[in-house]
Interface confidence: low
């Protein structure tokens, strides 16, 4: 760390005195202090001498000596007072600019430490400080106004009591600037607008900022609109509002509208689209397939997107059959508004029962008329199987009926021994029936198919099994011939009750 001679923190001299300040360091050293006249500087290697043979009040200030090559950045300082009985203050700057809530240092340095007890800060023309002005004083640095406010932008003077009278410094102008965090905040309403030709419309563009100096304009397809501006001041923010009122809209009013505001920090803009239509419209659509298949017992949400202007006057979900005359419970119907002109309507169908398959229609109405969107809901069922022994055209035949949805596939197995389900080790023969006869296939119902296996002679120590499967599951029925007649056995695990 450099060393200053004389080795005192403060030095008090009279005007006209000779002052010599010497700084010595390990390497080269530099002086830094208030800009003032009459100083001469002499350097030789590791020492530097600052001297004047005619000190004035303007030499009052703190002189700091630093060693640029020192990685620790050490420095030493000495404060010089040049106590001029006519000049109690040395003002280093006549304008100070800070942002709101920063501390503002008014750099009037006292030229005589003895005067510290009688100092005060006033505004020009002897006016007292504003209420709430919180300040402190340092004879080395001057007055600090703490957390300065915009309203404290004033001209100040430092006052010292000398021989019973107040002596003022030259004035210092404080400029407290509002902190402008960025471009003005913007709102443009509505975010989207639709009107029928001839209707009225209103678009409002507003911007706000803590500072009054900002501009706002509304433009239509890159053309700036001339709209009278309304101003306001709320919660310490200035607001400027542009309202575009259109009594009878036409197609030329349609297009993109941008609200643009700018200040010293930059520009903000936000846009909306205005659509002018010839007449009312109502469009229904769904992201889902209108033909739905769901496994019985599971749930389904049917969703319809509605785009409409003017707004809906009525809407409902209707069950169109074929199973019962029940209607969807209102509590299962839900409506959400995505924005002004788009809505989503959802019908929740939890734990679907066989009687709930069929057509579901969403109906909506606005001045443009009625529209409907219909979903077809088919339930999927795992196959149910039954086998009987009969004679067809004199031949012994095993007849397998399988019912489910989608249409089941049928496979016959012949295996050794008596079992309620053939396993691989027991299988003697397998027949696939690629085209079983469809007995019934009505919309929204199960499909029932029939497969025939002609058996000339029933082997008594064997089992004949009919297996049916579809995308939902499988079912089987084992037929065990016994001497007293044929015996059929559906495996327990394939009993099915919806």
């Amino acid at each position: 760390i450099p060393v200053i001679e004389p080795s005192v923190p403060e030095l008090v001299v009279k005007p006209g005195a000779t002052v010599t300040l010497r700084c010595v360091g390990n390497g080269s050293v530099e002086w830094d202090g208030p800009p003032s006249p009459h100083w001469t500087l002499y350097s030789d290697g590791s020492s530097s001498i600052l001297s004047t043979n005619n000190a004035t009040f303007q030499n009052t200030g703190t002189y700091r000596c630093t060693e640029p090559g020192d990685p620790l950045g050490g420095s030493a300082a000495i404060h010089l007072y040049v106590k001029d009985p006519a000049r109690p203050w040395n003002v280093l700057a006549q304008e100070v600019v800070v942002f709101e809530d920063q501390d503002a240092l008014l750099p009037c340095l006292l030229t005589d430490p003895v005067l510290e007890a009688g100092v005060s800060l006033v505004r020009v023309r002897g006016r007292p400080l504003m209420r709430h002005t919180n300040y402190s004083f340092s004879p080395w640095h001057g007055f600090t106004i703490h957390r300065a406010k915009f309203i404290q932008s004033q001209d100040y003077q430092c006052s010292a009591l000398m021989g019973g009278r107040k002596v003022m410094s030259i004035s210092i102008r404080l400029k407290v600037q509002k902190v402008i965090p960025g471009p003005p905040a913007l709102t443009l309403v509505p975010a989207e607008l639709v009107r029928i030709r001839g209707e009225a419309a209103q678009i409002v563009c507003s911007a706000s900022s803590v500072d009054v100096n900002f501009d706002v304009f509304l433009q239509h397809n890159n053309t700036k609109l001339a709209i009278p501006q309304q101003s306001d001041f709320h919660n310490n923010r200035y607001q400027k509002v542009l309202t575009l009122n259109l009594d009878q809209v036409d197609f030329q009013h349609a297009g993109n509208y941008s609200c643009v505001a700018s200040n010293v920090q930059g520009k903000h803009s936000t846009s909306m689209f205005f659509r002018v239509v010839e007449s009312a419209y109502l469009n229904l659509s769904s992201e889902q397939n209108l033909i739905q298949e769901v496994t019985v017992g599971e749930g389904l949400n049917l969703k319809v997107m509605v785009e409409a202007y003017p707004g809906l006057q009525g809407f409902n979900w209707t069950y169109l059959g074929p199973f019962s005359d029940h209607q969807p419970e209102p509590k299962l119907a839900n409506a959400t508004t995505k924005d002004t002109y788009r809505h989503t309507f959802t019908l929740s169908l939890p734990r679907l029962k066989p009687s709930e398959a069929g057509r579901y229609s969403f109906l909506a109405r606005n001045p443009g008329g009625w529209r409907a969107l219909t979903f077809e809901l088919t339930l999927r069922y795992p196959p149910e199987v039954s086998v009987i022994w009969t004679f067809i055209n004199g031949s012994g035949t095993l007849l397998c009926a399988a019912s489910g949805y989608p249409q089941p596939n049928v496979t016959w197995l012949q295996c050794s021994g008596h079992t309620d389900r053939c396993d691989e080790a027991q299988v003697l023969q397998v027949w696939d029936d690629p085209y079983p006869e469809v007995l019934s296939q009505e919309p929204f119902h199960k499909v029932t198919v029939q497969s025939l296996l002609t058996v000339e002679t029933l082997e008594h120590n064997q089992t004949y099994e009919c297996r049916a499967h579809n995308s939902v599951g499988s079912g089987s029925w084992a037929f065990i011939p016994i001497s007293a007649g044929a015996h059929t056995h559906p495996p327990d695990e394939f009993l099915f009750t919806p």
Partner: antibody, heavy 119, light 112 residues
Framework: QVQLVQSGAEVKKPGASVKVSCKVS????????MHWVRQAPGKGLEWMGG????????IYAQKFQGRVTMTEDTSTDTAYMELSSLRSEDTAVYYC????????????WGQGTLVTVSS | DIVMTQSPLSLPVTPGEPASISCRSS???????????LDWYLQKPGQSPQFLIY???IRASGVPDRFSGSGSGTDFALTISRVEAEDVGVYYC?????????FGQGTKVEIK
């Protein structure tokens, strides 16, 4: 929201003094600048004086200088207006009204205090 | 002191019709920040004055949009686009540029 509640009506004799109070709620008095305005029966509004935040002091209208004193009790957020050497032409409704420190318009106003000067 | 002059002093109006009050100041009320320091107040019968317009043209919150302020420098106006029965009372302009604050003489608006 600032609210101002003034003291009740007063009847005074000529030469006497009257002191009207104005209680502030919703804000503290130090956050506001308080002004006093009077209105003689059937006449217009007349500004008497008020705290000027830019001057840091209370300014009085020339007409009332030396007769009026406006004070504040910040511990109770109450402002006072005292008018001395009353004469019959001081019969009026006296209103307190506030402005913010950075703004100059008066909002809100107190409900008014009728001071009648009569011998 | 700045002298404020209002006209007319009395204004009979018909509900639904527009009405306009003029206010002139003896010197410009335009501040260096670009705003005109002129306010408008309405005193309804038997009530305290209420704040309507500030900085020449800005409506106070809660003031209906049928009230509008205009003007700059020394000439100002308060316009009611469609007078309603509740708008009757005395309207005052006030300059807030400097102390002492000064009011216009007031304009009495009454239904014809």
């Amino acid at each position: 929201q600032v609210q101002l509640v003034q003291s009740g009506a007063e009847v005074k004799k000529p030469g006497a003094s009257v002191k009207v109070s104005c209680k502030v709620s919703g804000y503290t008095l130090t956050e506001l600048s308080m002004h006093w305005v009077r209105q003689a029966p059937g006449k217009g509004l007349e500004w008497m004086g008020g705290f000027d935040p830019e001057d840091g002091e209370t300014i009085y209208a020339q007409k009332f200088q030396g007769r009026v004193t406006m004070t504040e009790d910040t511990s109770t957020d109450t402002a006072y207006m005292e008018l001395s050497s009353l004469r019959s032409e001081d019969t009026a409704v006296y209103y307190c009204a506030t402005a913010g420190l950075e703004i100059r318009w008066f909002d809100p106003w107190g409900q008014g205090t009728l001071v009648t000067v009569s011998s | 002191d700045i002298v404020m002059t209002q006209s007319p002093l009395s204004l009979p109006v018909t509900p639904g019709e527009p009405a306009s009050i003029s206010c002139r100041s003896s010197q410009s009320l335009l501040h260096s920040n670009g705003y005109n320091y002129l306010d408008w107040y309405l005193q309804k019968p038997g009530q305290s004055p209420q704040f309507l317009i500030y900085l020449g043209s800005i409506r106070a919150s809660g003031v209906p949009d049928r009230f509008s302020g205009s003007g700059s420098g020394t000439d100002f106006a308060l316009t009611i686009s469609r007078v309603e029965a509740e708008d009757v009372g005395v309207y005052y302009c006030m300059q807030a540029l400097q102390t002492p604050r000064t009011f216009g003489q007031g304009t009495k608006v009454e239904i014809k």
